[in-house]
Amino acid sequence: KELKVTQPEKSVSVAAGDSTVLNCTLTSLLPVGPIKWYRGVGQSRLLIYSFTGEHFPRVTNVSDATKRNNMDFSIRISNVTPEDAGTYYCVKFQKGPSEPDTEIQSGGGTEVYVLAKPS
């Protein structure tokens, strides 16, 4: 099956202090390689979460990514702050014959708007 990375929501709004889910699904796990979430694009993009076992504060996977046929790479960001605002991209990599892995496809991006906490 041809690989496609889908981020269904173009944008989400979340109140500061709340949690939000950023959805991402794949149509294929091949070629093998990691899936990572970034905020922003280009050289200045920031790694938000990687499905490779590391711990990321405030960010967790939504589905059980240890399922060998898992195609859902959605994440939950907890206790959102204004600094979390921006556009988030779900990115599929192909393992490299040597470091680093090669980015092969990105989702369309989901913009996160952080609303002031109601007083």
């Epitope: 091949l30 093998v32 059980d64 240890t66 393992k95």
Partner: antibody
Framework: DVQLVESGGAVVRPGESLRLSCAAS????????MSWVRQAPGKGLEWLAG????????YYIDSVKGRFTISRDNSENSLYLQMNSLTAEDTAVYYC???????????WGLGTLVTVSS | ALTQPASVSANPGETVKITCSGG??????YGWYQQKSPGSAPVTVI????KRPSDIPSRFSGSASGSAATLTITGVRVEDEAVYYC???????????FGAGTTLTVL
């Protein structure tokens, strides 16, 4: 420190059943997929079965499908292998192993010996 | 099936390469496991093609290209004498496979 301790190995007769256990400690067990691997006397390593972190998905090598069942109890930090209709070919040391994100192995138990003999 | 040489030998200080072929680079990740005696617990020396656990000496390294993976031991030591198993995880079939093992003798 990550620790995996297998138990339940025994001498059994052909056709009998046995349940192996693996007690895990030193890591968040419920976050990791796990596998069982065996080694018959004088032979190499053979992967048998794997299970997802939540326990809903299981995977088996063809030769044990239908006879062996992998399961886990995350509240007890334990992994299990139920083995039915055992034959002499199942005689081996059985290891539990923690899986990496891409379903290879990073930590192994010391193993438990299963002997099937009449 | 994954294929690796039955045995290799080297003098202390030499560089040893053990190859493992038969996987598909598009769908396979490789790992390497050291077993010092039959029935003893294997030790992971490389996983994810080239990732070395923190407690494994830096003389062990791994790589994968095409349909093969390679374990390299740079400056081999007597204590590295063991059987080394390669393993692959196939993302097409969701199955793990081991090679038959390579006995490393340090002369």
């Amino acid at each position: 420190d990550v620790q995996l301790v297998e138990s339940g190995g025994a001498v059994v007769r052909p056709g009998e059943s046995l349940r192996l256990s693996c007690a895990a400690s030193g890591f968040t067990f419920s976050s990791y997929a796990m596998s069982w691997v065996r080694q018959a006397p004088g032979k190499g390593l053979e992967w048998l079965a794997g299970i997802s972190a939540g326990g809903s998905d299981t995977y088996y090598i063809d030769s044990v499908k239908g006879r062996f069942t992998i399961s886990r109890d995350n509240s007890e930090n334990s992994l299990y292998l139920q083995m039915n209709s055992l034959t002499a070919e199942d005689t081996a040391v059985y290891y539990c192993a923690r899986e990496t994100w891409n379903h290879l192995f990073d930590y192994w138990g010391l193993g438990t010996l299963v002997t099937v003999s009449s | 099936a994954l294929t690796q040489p039955a045995s290799v030998s080297a003098n202390p200080g030499e560089t040893v390469k053990i190859t493992c072929s038969g996987g598909d680079w598009y769908s396979t990740y490789y790992g390497w496991y050291q077993q010092k005696s039959p029935g003893s617990a294997p030790v992971t020396v490389i996983h994810s093609d080239d990732k070395r656990p923190s407690d494994i000496p830096s003389r062990f390294s791994g790589s994968a290209s095409g349909s093969a993976a390679t374990l390299t031991i740079t400056g081999v030591r007597v204590e590295d004498e063991a059987v080394y198993y390669c393993a692959g995880y196939d993302g097409r079939t969701y199955i793990n496979t081991f090679g038959a093992g390579t006995t490393l003798t340090v002369l």
